[in-house]
């Protein structure tokens, strides 16, 4: 649902040599660049696979959906997809799989209709906190982004360079508050271990919110209280070992909100009181019924809903596997 | 990389103010709550309050309320913690300091001497 | 506010050994409690946070752990240039607050 898709009809394949002989001019009306398929009909262009190195410079200016996944793009420059004239309809992007490495500030300007973006599976060691807003201003003009998807964008650990991986993906997200239209972000599968303070107050439109398969250990300075549009949370196979009275309240207070916890080592002591009683009588926790505690390990499988206040004493030792994620 | 750069050390009388600056370099400015701390020579920390600078948003330590207060200026990313009736108790190094984890400072200042002398 | 008692305030160590402080909170802090080294004349640096994880760049002989009420700091063989005060800080619940500090020195 959040990647571009094609009504695939009738696309035809160029011949290899007609790239290079009109790059340096704008694009016919129904050329197609080497190495892809075109469908002026369902406004699509596929570049898959295709082992690119760079994005193609003569793409059709009719471009609504494109594909360019499973290349080998390495690094996208500032103004990757200005064109003249501009690629003005370009609505959904999708460069998932190429073995991007850096984005650079600026790198998606002159897309006035960008509402898709995809760059899950690719290891971002650098990715500029201007790579979305465009320009380093405090107050930036706003994206027209309404979905970005950043999945398992998590660079192996000896090409993150010496950084927090959290604070780059946060400060790109944040910049020049040009992301406040955002509605969709999906960040799993990102070793996430925290989330700045605050942090999602500053993305006031979001519907839906996927961290699931992260570290995150704690919850207790992520604040929900501003996100009152917010449908989904998924939280699955993260680290979380209680949610606190703070949390519970406010995902309580969220009009249309439905939450994913399954997979947490949720550790069944006296902490986990407010959240068991809690859980008894939300609706919002989706399979609720699944969730069970890790830990102590008399309680290892227990369902948290069959548990009552005499099952949860303190204080466990916690085993060394708890201890970091 | 990551920076705070601070102002230089104040010889202050008694019962005078004092405003420290603190600019920041290197992240998004906006994204980080700045907090600031209190070490008095020889002794352990203490937190005085911190500072969300996409909105200005405050929240102190109760001992420091009335005593410190705290700005930011977005436009030059810099944050500010004004000392006011200063006292030789408020002699120390001030430090600000870039919040990661939260609540957790991940990069510091390099500290402003503070000394309240008559 | 909730106090943190750090023990011990002094530790006398030789290269090589195995050094752990201890970190007691007045009340349950969860896992929200950070670590810091600071070497003299230098400011506080950020060592491990929710009590476990060790910050980005950090050597891994500085080892966290605890939940609750206790916690505990160790590093698991000493160097040189380990010789610092250590401190504990609860992040759990404001006012912020800080362990008085363990400071190590060479025998």
């Known amino acids: 649902s959040s990647s571009p898709t094609s009504s695939a009809s009738s696309f035809s394949s160029s011949a290899p040599f007609l790239a290079s002989a009109v790059s340096a001019q704008p694009p016919l009306p129904d050329q197609c660049p080497a190495l892809c398929e075109c469908s002026e009909a369902a406004r699509t262009v596929k570049c898959v696979n295709r082992n690119l190195t760079e994005v193609p410079t003569d793409l059709p200016a009719y471009v609504r959906n494109l594909f360019l996944t499973g290349n080998q793009l390495a690094v996208l420059p500032a103004g990757a997809f200005a064109r003249r004239p501009p690629l003005a309809e370009l609505a959904a992007l999708n460069l998932s799989g190429s073995r991007l490495d850096e984005v650079r500030a600026g790198a998606f300007e002159h897309l006035p209709s960008l509402r898709q973006l995809d760059l899950s599976h690719n290891p971002l060691a650098d990715l500029s906190p201007f790579a979305f807003s465009g320009s380093n201003a405090s107050v930036s003009a706003p994206s027209p982004l309404v979905e970005l998807i950043l999945n398992h964008i998590v660079p192996p650990e000896d090409e993150r360079q010496n950084r927090s991986f959290e604070g780059m993906v946060v400060a790109a997200l944040l910049a020049g508050r040009a992301l406040q239209g955002l509605r969709r972000l999906e960040l799993a599968s990102n070793h996430f271990l925290y989330l700045p303070r605050d942090v999602l107050a500053q993305l006031p439109s979001l519907r839906h919110l996927d961290l699931s398969n992260n570290s995150l250990v704690s919850l207790t300075y992520v604040s929900f209280r501003n996100l009152t549009h917010l449908e989904s949370l998924h939280l699955e196979d993260n680290a979380l070992k209680v949610l606190h009275n703070g949390t519970l309240a406010e995902l309580q207070g969220l009009p249309h909100i439905r939450v994913f916890l399954d997979n947490n080592p949720w550790v069944c002591d006296c902490h986990m009181a407010d959240m068991v009683t809690w859980l008894k009588e939300t609706e919002v926790v989706q399979g609720k019924d699944r969730l069970t505690c890790a830990y102590p390990e008399k309680m290892r499988n227990r369902v948290l809903l069959e548990l009552n206040s005499a099952d949860l004493d303190c204080d466990p030792i916690l085993p060394p596997s708890l201890q970091t994620s | 990389q990551v920076q705070l750069q601070q102002s230089g050390p104040e010889l202050v009388k008694p019962g005078a103010s004092v405003k420290i600056s603190c600019k920041a370099s290197g992240y998004t400015f906006t994204a980080y709550y700045v907090n600031w701390v209190k070490q008095s020579h020889g002794k352990s920390l203490e937190w005085i309050g911190d500072?969300?600078?996409?909105?200005?948003?405050?929240n102190y330590n109760q001992k420091f309320k009335g005593k410190a207060t705290l700005t930011v200026d977005m436009s030059s990313s810099t944050a500010y913690m004004e000392l006011r009736s200063l006292t030789s108790e408020d002699s120390a190094v001030y430090y600000c300091?870039?919040?990661?984890?939260?609540?957790?400072?991940?990069?510091w200042g390099q500290g402003t001497s503070v000394t309240v002398s008559s | 506010s909730i106090v943190l008692t750090q023990t011990p305030k002094f530790l006398l160590v030789s290269a090589g050994d195995r050094v752990p402080i201890t970190c007691k909170a007045s009340q349950s802090v969860s896992n929200n409690v950070a670590w810091y080294q600071q070497k003299p004349g230098q400011s506080p640096k950020l060592l491990i946070y929710?009590?476990?994880n060790p910050y980005t760049g950090v050597p891994d002989r500085f080892t966290g752990s605890g939940y609750g009420t206790d916690f505990t700091f160790t590093i698991t063989t000493v160097q040189a240039e380990d010789l610092a005060v250590y401190f504990c800080?609860?992040?759990?619940?404001?006012?912020?607050?800080f362990g008085g500090g363990t400071k190590l020195e060479m025998k």
């Open positions: 300091a870039k919040e990661g984890p939260p609540g957790a400072m991940d990069y």
């Open positions: 929710y009590a476990s």
């Open positions: 500072i969300n600078p996409n909105n200005g948003g405050t």
């Open positions: 800080q609860q992040v759990y619940s404001s006012p912020f607050t």
